[in-house]
């Protein structure tokens, strides 16, 4: 092992555990983590007599380094006396010494909170000729504290006579002020208020913040939703600017097209957020044909608080196309929620990631607020998937027990949509293509070709799936078969996944 100097710790008792009539008391010093032997421990007992005992060094199991304890027993007026333990480790260097000065016992205390406040800029957002830093040391058990100001870690020569202490109930607070020239403050140095109390150090630091920019303005430009593009046939794109600091300067958003052709009239909205920042959105209608043919649209953002203009561009996603597979299923009844049921829709393996998901009931599209749909996530392969969740009520399914999950995607043919119906009570459902969920089986229609079920939405079932005859203990209509997986070594009725 290489040479290692010791860490030194004072060992004291709690004051409340020492009897008031005690004539002598023992305190200690721990030197640990050093290598090689030896360390030399000496004590400064001031005006008091004391006897010392240094215990033999022990080896720390994991590191192979050493630890030792030196004990000092003093008698007399020890309560007001400070003691210094001096540890020397000559293998580290001939003058290596660590001193720890402490009293016989430690009192329970509430440590201070240290916080630096700084004077504000003038009305124009500029720094005044001098900057005041105020160090607030608050909420500590009354006792001696020392305040030191540091500049980039170096002690500053500061008049601390201005520090003032107040007491509120059982706790005390102190404040100290530091005045800096504008030049010092702008030089980007770090200023620290360091407080020493009960042998511990507490501190807070500050420096000039980055210039008057907010927390990084961000700009985003969305593509039109497939629903707007293919169903409503009135696509729009939105330029979103977030985290702007509200100020007199306005955000300037300018739209353009890479082809140089004119753009439509855009609509703009500004919103003040709870965190005090401003969000600006500008929505631009685009031509369906222009978009499909690959036009690039650009949104240029300028603002007094932005170092440079930001430009965001958007165009039709390039790359391979794949239509979505859609699977819809109902969750089983849950104890205590007989009048509500959750429907789920898994839409997967589509490319590109732009997709719109809708739910329909009674041929009417349900409001978007009714369902919750995840953002597209990448599958293990090259496509994307989303989940959509819809809560339905008994009143709805008793009126008509058929809910449709519809995906709108550019690769879906013939009309850019794929949809699947799902029922809360599949046994009572009508005959449209459905993917139903039983407690541990998937139901398939019996109208199969070459012994294969017409699984969810006509997709090919898992190669190891087949449709077995309906079981007597399965309360379904006779025209439904049970799709089971032929898993080796398992009963043929075990279902372990969507077929």
């Amino acid at each position: 092992a290489s040479t290692q100097s010791p860490s030194v710790f004072p060992l004291t008792r709690c004051c409340k555990n020492i009897p008031s009539n005690a004539t002598s008391v023992t305190l200690g010093c721990l030197a640990t983590g050093y290598f090689p032997e030896p360390v030399m421990v000496t004590w400064d007992t001031g005006s008091l007599n004391g006897t010392t005992m240094t215990l033999p060094a022990t080896t720390l199991t994991l590191s192979g380094h050493y630890a030792t304890i030196s004990l000092l027993t003093v008698s007399g007026a020890w309560a007001k006396q400070m003691f210094t333990c001096r540890v020397a480790h000559t293998p580290s260097s001939t003058d290596w010494v660590d001193n720890k000065t402490f009293s016989v016992c430690s009192r329970d205390f509430t440590p201070p909170t240290v916080k630096i406040l700084q004077s504000s800029c003038d009305g124009g957002g500029h720094f005044p000729p001098t900057i005041q830093l105020l160090c607030l040391v608050s909420g500590y058990t009354p006792g001696t504290i020392n305040i030191t100001w540091l500049e980039d870690g170096q002690v500053m020569d500061v008049d601390l006579s201005t520090a003032s202490t107040t007491q509120e109930g059982e706790l005390a607070s102190t404040q100290s002020e530091l005045t800096l020239s504008q030049k010092h403050w702008l030089s980007d140095r770090t200023y620290t208020c360091q407080v020493t109390y009960q042998g511990h150090t507490f501190e807070d630091s500050t420096k000039k913040c980055a210039d008057s920019n907010p927390r990084g303005v961000s700009a985003y430009l969305s593509r039109p939703s497939p629903f707007d593009l293919f169903i409503r046939k009135s696509p729009t794109i939105t330029c979103l600017v977030v985290d702007l600091a509200p100020s007199k300067g306005t955000v300037n958003l300018t739209w353009s097209r890479a082809s140089g052709k004119p753009v439509n009239h855009s609509t703009r909205k500004e919103e003040k957020q709870r965190n005090g920042t401003l969000t600006v959105t500008s929505t631009l209608p685009v031509g369906t044909r222009d978009w499909i043919e690959g036009e690039t649209y650009q949104c240029r953002v300028t603002h007094p608080h932005l170092p440079r203009a930001l430009m965001r561009s958007t165009t039709k996603t390039s790359g391979p196309r794949a239509a979505p597979e859609v699977y819809a299923f109902a969750t089983p009844e849950w104890p205590g929620s007989r009048d509500k049921r959750t429907l789920a829709c898994l839409i997967q393996n589509f490319m590109p990631e732009d997709i719109s998901v809708q739910w329909l009931h009674n041929e009417v599209q349900l409001p978007d607020a009714r369902h919750s749909t995840t953002q597209p996530r990448k599958t293990k392969g090259s496509g994307f998937f989303v989940f959509s969740r819809l809560e339905v009520t008994r009143a709805e399914w008793e009126q008509k027990d058929e809910f449709i999950c519809r995906a709108v995607h550019e690769a879906a043919s013939p009309s850019q949509t794929v949809q699947r119906a799902v029922s809360v009570n599949p046994g009572l459902a009508g005959g449209s293509a459905q993917s139903q969920r039983a407690p541990d089986r998937v139901l398939c229609h019996s109208g199969q070709q070459q012994g294969l079920p017409r699984a969810a939405g006509g997709s090919v079932p898992h190669p190891r799936c087949h449709c077995g005859a309906g079981r007597a203990d399965w309360p379904g209509p006779p025209e439904l078969d049970v799709c089971v997986e032929e898993a080796e070594g398992e009963a043929p009725w075990t279902w372990t996944g969507l077929c």
């Epitope: 210039d211 920019n213 927390r215 303005v217 700009a219 300067g249 440079r308 203009a309 930001l310 430009m311």
Partner: antibody, heavy 119, light 110 residues
């Protein structure tokens, strides 16, 4: 065509000051954010400061306090004032124009002016 | 502040070689990554902006790619006039940034 011509460089003693100028022509200066970039001999490019079209400015952390960027659109000129010069400020200082549409980097650079700080 | 790390710092190649230079951002950036070419005694010249769009007059053998934190500049078939130093730049910072340039990659003749 777009032209940026820097001037004001030269030999200066440590602790001294310099004011670099950048004369712009061939485009409307007020439409562009402008940047100063420096390059020490044999070293890479180092961003110094930027001033946007509104006249607000930003500096690299190390440049705060000693460097001041400004612009006078009526004179088609951008300035960089450097105070308390140090040996490590020795570099070629380039005046550069940000692309108009933004987010796309610097499309035009001046030839640069050499600042040498030495006693 | 976002830091841009370029690698390698230098590369030796022959005319006709395919050369790829990478630039890594310390955090994800939107798309405003630019690439510059600089020859001795000259100012830098913009090659690529928006991480993949060729600047006017730049030969098609130069191409840019990448997203998020990883970006690359590729020269498909190195020409004699391509021996130079190349820099990437985070050109889209909407806030204070300390050094927006990568450290540079010198492409030398093998």
């Amino acid at each position: 065509q777009v032209q940026l011509v820097e001037s004001g460089g030269g030999l200066v003693q440590p602790g001294g000051s310099l004011r670099l100028s950048c004369a712009a022509s061939g485009f409307t200066l007020s439409n562009h954010d402008m940047t100063w970039v420096r390059q020490a001999p044999g070293k890479g490019l180092e961003y110094v400061s930027i001033i946007n079209t509104y006249g607000n400015h930003w500096y690299a952390n190390w440049a705060s306090g000693r460097f001041t960027i400004s612009r006078d659109n009526s004179k088609n000129t951008v300035y960089l004032q450097i105070d308390s010069l140090r040996a490590e400020d020795t570099a070629t200082y380039y005046c550069a124009r940000e692309t108009h549409h933004g987010s796309s980097g610097i499309d035009h650079w001046g030839q640069g002016t050499l600042v040498t700080v030495s006693s | 502040d976002i830091q841009m790390t370029q690698s390698p710092s230098s590369v030796s190649a022959s005319v006709g070689d395919r050369v790829t230079i990478t630039c890594q951002a310390s955090e994800s950036i939107y798309s405003g990554l630019a690439w510059y070419q600089q020859k001795p005694g000259q100012p830098p010249k913009l090659l690529i902006y928006d991480h993949r769009t060729l600047a006017r007059g730049v030969p098609s053998r130069f191409s840019g790619s990448g997203s998020g934190t990883e970006y690359a500049l590729t020269i498909s078939s190195l020409q004699p006039e391509d021996f130079a130093t190349y820099y990437c730049q985070h050109a889209d910072y909407a806030h204070h940034s300390d050094n927006v340039f990568g450290g540079g990659t010198k492409v030398e003749i093998k």
